[in-house]
Amino acid sequence: ATKLTEEKYELKEGQTLDVKCDYTLEKFASSQKAWQIIRDGEMPKTLACTERPSKNSHPVQVGRIILEDYHDHGLLRVRMVNLQVEDSGLYQCVIYQPPKEPHMLFDRIRLVVTKGFSGTPGSNENSTQNVYKIPPTTTKALCPLYTSPRTVTQAPPKSTADVSTPDSEINLTNVTDIIRVPVFN
């Protein structure tokens, strides 16, 4: 089994977690991908997922989480904006591949969010000045209801139906982060 490793990433309240999860292009380009949190003693919980099949460069927003899947680059970009202390925890990117178990991408991220925003006057990330709000056309994808155990040798999801429950997402408002699509050469 692959050794599960994690990397600590520490940010302040109000900041944005911005990570890139790599995947094998040939195998997973159009597969549905998800961002999960793993709480102690619990199974991973899906917070947001891409569409099924995943669309190229098409932002999906669930609350303060934005997912963008770049098929040409084998890369899922995950952003959690306006971080709160309560967001601290262990996160991972996974690929849904029913009937097989979800495939974990990269190392897990141990996010630590501390009090106190680091911004200078007039340059707050959450300022309403010069802010590009996420367009209303952004998709909120439906995620599989169940997620798999925390081990790498996981059992298949109990259900792969495209259903969503209130428990499977973060519903928060006031998303005023500046969102820009990366420019690839």
Partner: antibody
Framework: EVQLLESGGGMVQPGGSLRLSCAVS????????MSWVRQAPGKGLEWVSE????????YYADSVKGRFTISRDNSKNTLYLQMNSLRVEDTAIYYC????????????WGQGTLVTVSS | EIVMTQSPATLSVSPGERATLSCRAS??????LAWYQQKPGQAPRLLIY???TRATGIPARFSGSGSGTEFTLTISSLQSEDFAVYYC??????????FGQGTKVEIK
């Protein structure tokens, strides 16, 4: 302990070629994106190229696109930079660097290898 | 391409004094900014990431602040080993990953 060790630098004439290597240890090489960053004598840092981990996607600075090729051998824990059609302005110390925490900032660097392009 | 501009180019400070270095991005990079220290003959060393988080093993006298386009690195009380060149780097838009031109902190 994480270690990155570059080699392959040297003197070459304009239009010539060199292949740099970066042998790494202390982390799961195949999982991480790696980059080459260079520094011309007395100048600042310039990102040159990156190769992602699982996807193997590659990216280049405009100044080297079409001339340099980044690659990796995960079985040998080694990153490479093939440099062709070298120019005088490519003269620099070339560092390989490991990406930190799913993001393109660099927490570990090699000691660098000097490439001198001169006639 | 996002252009990173650092100021001043050179900062002359006495040991024990405070040093304030600035970095400006040509467009917002949110908090996706890192600071590196480089001493002569050595590779750069990561000091700060996420605009304000100290990397492992970095002393508390180093602090970063800012978001969007304006960032600051502060060294509260300069020690002899802090005299070096400091670079900022954005990792919001990629590629390329762009660095500032550097600020040299020298002994006054």
């Amino acid at each position: 302990e994480v270690q990155l060790l570059e080699s392959g630098g040297g003197m070459v004439q304009p239009g010539g070629s060199l292949r740099l290597s970066c042998a790494v240890s202390g982390f799961t090489f195949s999982r991480y994106a790696m980059s080459w960053v260079r520094q011309a004598p007395g100048k600042g840092l310039e990102w040159v190229s990156e190769m992602r981990g699982s996807s193997g996607s590659t990216y280049y600075a405009d100044s080297v696109k079409g001339r340099f090729t980044i690659s990796r051998d995960n079985s040998k824990n080694t990153l490479y930079l093939q440099m062709n059609s070298l120019r005088v302005e490519d003269t620099a110390i070339y560092y390989c660097a490991k990406e930190f925490s799913s993001n393109s900032l660099f927490d570990y660097w090699g000691q660098g290898t000097l490439v001198t392009v001169s006639s | 391409e996002i252009v990173m501009t650092q100021s001043p180019a050179t900062l002359s400070v006495s040991p024990g004094e405070r040093a304030t270095l600035s970095c400006r991005a040509s467009q917002s990079v949110n908090s996706n900014l890192a600071w590196y220290q480089q001493k002569p003959g050595q590779a750069p060393r990561l000091l700060i990431y996420g605009a304000s988080t100290r990397a492992t093993g970095i002393p508390a006298r180093f602090s970063g602040s800012g978001s969007g386009t304006e960032f600051t690195l502060t060294i509260s009380s300069l020690q002899s080993e802090d005299f070096a060149v400091y670079y900022c780097q954005q990792f919001y838009n990629w590629p390329p990953y762009t660095f500032g031109q550097g600020t040299k902190v020298e002994i006054k």
